[in-house]
């Protein structure tokens, strides 16, 4: 159950999808990826205030316990709820091949 | 691909399963849950240093970009990789029922 999408901290401050441009060198991929030379990495960044985009029951519990014991229990964290596939042309044991990665680019975010 | 399980920060400092004892009042459940009166909540807590229990390619990217742009990209976060089911005896519109929740107690943790 995804809870509220209204961010009480102000526009853009809560958990949402961001795009970060990164080179192969930035990613440490220069020695095994041929293409693309640059990746638009979509990732989940932002705060997870009470019940904001709570992914499930566990996230709701975490929010309650964080309120009670903030030094022991961290607030929920903004992570991918789903991914978009990405194709890389990469070096492999048997030459160069096209590989699809299903867990590389975040598509949607939630708090957990 | 789950990466290294060795914590460079010292024993117990990295992402792992913790148990937090919580009453129904703590969880805000006192008005709709009859049993159990207390829950041993298992949750994922701890740091996610470079490549520690990296859940997938996205987590590896996040580590690389956090190292480069720590103010923009947060470090990976310790979250459940899987859950244990939990049965609650709860009040419903038509009386009392037994409900199984599949997303309440963390079973295993990883960094993402």
């Amino acid at each position: 159950a995804r809870n509220g999408d209204h961010c009480p901290l102000g526009p853009g401050r809560c958990c949402r999808l961001h795009t970060v441009r990164a080179s192969l060198e930035d990613l440490g991929w220069a020695d095994w990826v041929l293409s693309p030379r640059e990746v638009q990495v979509t990732m989940c960044i932002g705060a997870c205030p009470s019940q904001f985009r709570a992914a499930n029951m566990h996230a709701q519990i975490k929010t309650s316990l964080h309120r009670l014991k903030p030094d022991t229990v961290p607030a929920p964290c903004c992570v991918p709820a789903s991914y978009n596939p990405m194709v890389l042309i990469q070096k492999t044991d048997t030459g160069v091949s096209l590989q699809t990665y299903d867990d590389l680019l975040a598509k949607d975010c939630h708090c957990i | 691909a789950r990466n290294g399980d060795h914590c460079p920060l010292g024993p117990g400092r990295c992402c792992r399963l913790h148990t937090v004892r919580a009453s129904l009042e703590d969880l805000g459940w006192a008005d709709w849950v009859l049993s159990p009166r207390e829950v041993q909540v298992t949750m994922c807590i701890g740091a996610c240093p470079s490549q520690f229990r990296a859940a997938n390619m996205h987590a590896q990217i996040k580590t690389s970009l956090h190292r480069l742009k720590p103010d923009t990209v947060p470090a990976p976060c310790c979250v459940p990789a899987s859950y244990n089911p939990m049965v609650l005896i709860q009040k419903t519109d038509t009386g009392v029922s037994l409900q199984t929740y599949d997303d309440l107690l963390a079973k295993d943790c990883h960094c993402i």
Epitope: I89, K91, G95, V96, S97, L98 | -
Partner: antibody, heavy 112, light 107 residues
Framework: QVQLQQSGAELVKPGASVKLSCKAS????????INWVRQRPEQGLEWIGW????????KYNEKFKDKATLTTDTSSSTAYMQLIRLTSEDSAVYFC?????WGQGTTLTVSS | DNKMTQSPSSMYASLGERVTITCKAS??????LSWFQQKPGKSPKTLIY???KLVDGVPSRFSGSGSGQDYSLTISSLEYEDMGIYHC?????????FGGGTKLEIK
Amino acid sequence: QVQLQQSGAELVKPGASVKLSCKASGYTFTNYDINWVRQRPEQGLEWIGWIFPGDGSTKYNEKFKDKATLTTDTSSSTAYMQLIRLTSEDSAVYFCARILYWGQGTTLTVSS
Amino acid sequence: DNKMTQSPSSMYASLGERVTITCKASQDINSYLSWFQQKPGKSPKTLIYRANKLVDGVPSRFSGSGSGQDYSLTISSLEYEDMGIYHCLQYDEFPYTFGGGTKLEIK
């Protein structure tokens, strides 16, 4: 099974051009690279160049960059190598290959 | 370019003998090295890839080893059908480069 079927022997006159073909089967043509290799009589193997059918990118041995042009036709899963301004020095057997698989070779004879 | 120096350029060996051929790269090739066997008038046949992985269907008497710049192909017990020319290829960086070849003949 993977097969690379090359076109038949060619006899051409000096100064002419020729286009050799390599038809791939048994795998997804656009997902793997193809190399072209030359073997002159009683000599070793020389790497001419590389093409990735997925995006058409190419790499050439500096020695052959003004001699060879690599292309592909993805609709027929065929790789081509065009050789221009032929001289007797270009008489050789030409192979298309992946790291694990080799075509049977095409014999090119340049003679007036 | 990464130059591949293969040795010996030719050799004679007896049936049942252990044979080793080496390839040295001028720079580290991260184990991106393959070995081929070629018989007269035939196309090369890949034996080993990524320095030490045996191609399916290739007899287990063939093995590859090495890392960094130095690699070797070993035939544990030479058989008659093993005579031919052996080539190495580095496919770590473009341009890919071949060794000069080793002609193996039976004594």
